[in-house]
């Protein structure tokens, strides 16, 4: 799902307040709901009819430093006999997510949000078939 | 996939620099890669063998204000005949993502990252069957 553009008003103070310096805001350290955890079933990536692998990208100046990307293993889907059925499609499910980018120039450290496109897993889809004349 | 805890060092300046005030940092406005877009196939949520619906939550003090959650339509998966096959499972694919929370007390506005668990879509899984003795 796509993240809309950040509205100009999102970083502004209420109208009755003195304006803030252009370009930067105060970011509190710490993460709300930091201990919340995914409760996804184990091994769904290998048990799915549209199985996938994971690869990890690492960047120490990004939070989270580790971003995991899924890649569908097949073009088709796995049928009840464990064979690939090419009449069906394994399709990536993508999600726009935010990460925090750390930027430093000498002793000046600032942070900025960055939009990252993550492939979270794959699903098996019945393709719409068109015969070209 | 889960986001690890934010390391204490992530918000710190290099050792040779004077320490920053405890608890808050400078957040640059604007989003890196803001124009990047999901290029997911159209209507995969209805054409998947594990189809899903979307619901939208809205919060004006969060960026993005709109967070979309998927819910699997069925317990089982849809077979080639368009019927539900309960020997297979529609399983949610979840992703931990970050949002930006806006907090204001009077004219003081600050921001904090918040972890949100998003169900992005569903995949069809073949379960391993055990008979309990």
């Amino acid at each position: 799902r796509k993240i809309p553009k950040v509205g100009h008003t999102f970083f502004q103070k209420p109208e009755s307040c003195p304006p803030v310096p252009e370009g930067s805001m105060k970011l509190d350290t710490g993460i709300i709901n930091e201990n919340q955890r995914v409760s996804m079933s184990r091994n769904i990536e290998s048990r799915s009819t549209s199985p996938w692998n994971y690869t990890v990208t690492w960047d120490p100046n990004r939070y989270p430093s580790e971003v995991v990307q899924a890649q569908c293993k097949h073009l088709g889907c796995i049928n009840a006999q464990g064979k690939e059925d090419i009449s069906m499609n394994s399709v990536p499910i993508q999600q726009e997510t935010l990460v925090l980018r750390r930027k430093h120039q000498g002793c000046s450290v600032s942070f900025q949000l960055e939009k990252v496109l993550v492939t979270v897993g794959c699903t098996c889809v019945t393709p719409v078939v068109h015969h070209v004349q | 996939r889960k986001i690890p805890k934010v390391g204490h060092t992530f918000f710190q300046k290099p050792e040779s620099c004077p320490p920053v005030p405890e608890g808050s940092m400078k957040l640059d406005t604007g989003i890196i890669n803001e124009n990047q877009r999901v290029s997911m196939s159209r209507n995969i949520e209805s054409r998947s063998t594990s189809p899903w619906n979307y619901t939208v939550t809205w919060d004006p003090n969060r960026y993005p204000s709109e967070v979309v959650q998927a819910q699997c339509k069925h317990l089982g998966c849809i077979n080639a005949q368009g019927k539900e096959d309960i020997s297979m499972n529609s399983v949610p694919i979840q992703q931990e993502t970050l949002v930006l929370r806006r907090k204001h007390q009077g004219c003081s506005v600050s921001f904090q990252l918040e972890k949100v668990l998003v169900t992005v879509g569903c995949t069809c899984v073949t379960p391993v069957v055990h008979h309990v003795q």
């Epitope: 079933s41 184990r42 | 699997c72 317990l75 499972n89 399983v91 379960p127 069957v129 309990v132």
Partner: nanobody, 116 residues
């Protein structure tokens, strides 16, 4: 290891009610859905009813819709099947099923007999 304890089966007259219960214990975390199947001699097991753990979404076989009601107790890891207006064709062994998405556990079954 996961344990499933089924209870509530028995013999009743047509039109009567019964309530089946199933309790899960052991490593029964990350529940996807919980439900019931049934089987009569010489036939395949058929799905009766299921309830998704996360949001209590329910599904029923057409043959029991409007007569059977499935419910869950998250705190106790139990699922109940309230069976009303029972018919002789509901006679079967009823199996509790606990589904953990990638693993599915079947109970040993409890007999329900409905006489006319």
């Amino acid at each position: 290891e996961v344990q499933l304890v089924e209870s509530g089966g028995g013999s009743v007259q047509a039109g009567d009610s019964l309530r089946l219960s199933c309790a899960a214990s052991g490593r029964a975390n990350s529940i996807n859905w919980f439900g019931w199947f049934r089987q009569t001699p010489g036939k395949e097991r058929e799905f009766v009813a299921g309830i998704r753990w996360s949001d209590a979404y329910t599904e029923y076989a057409n043959s029991v819709k409007g007569r059977f009601t499935i419910s869950r107790d998250n705190a106790k890891n139990t699922v109940d099947l309230q069976m009303d207006s029972l018919k002789p064709e509901d006679t079967a062994v009823y199996y509790c099923v606990l589904d953990l998405s990638t693993v599915r556990y079947w109970g040993q079954g409890t007999q329900v007999t409905v006489s006319s």
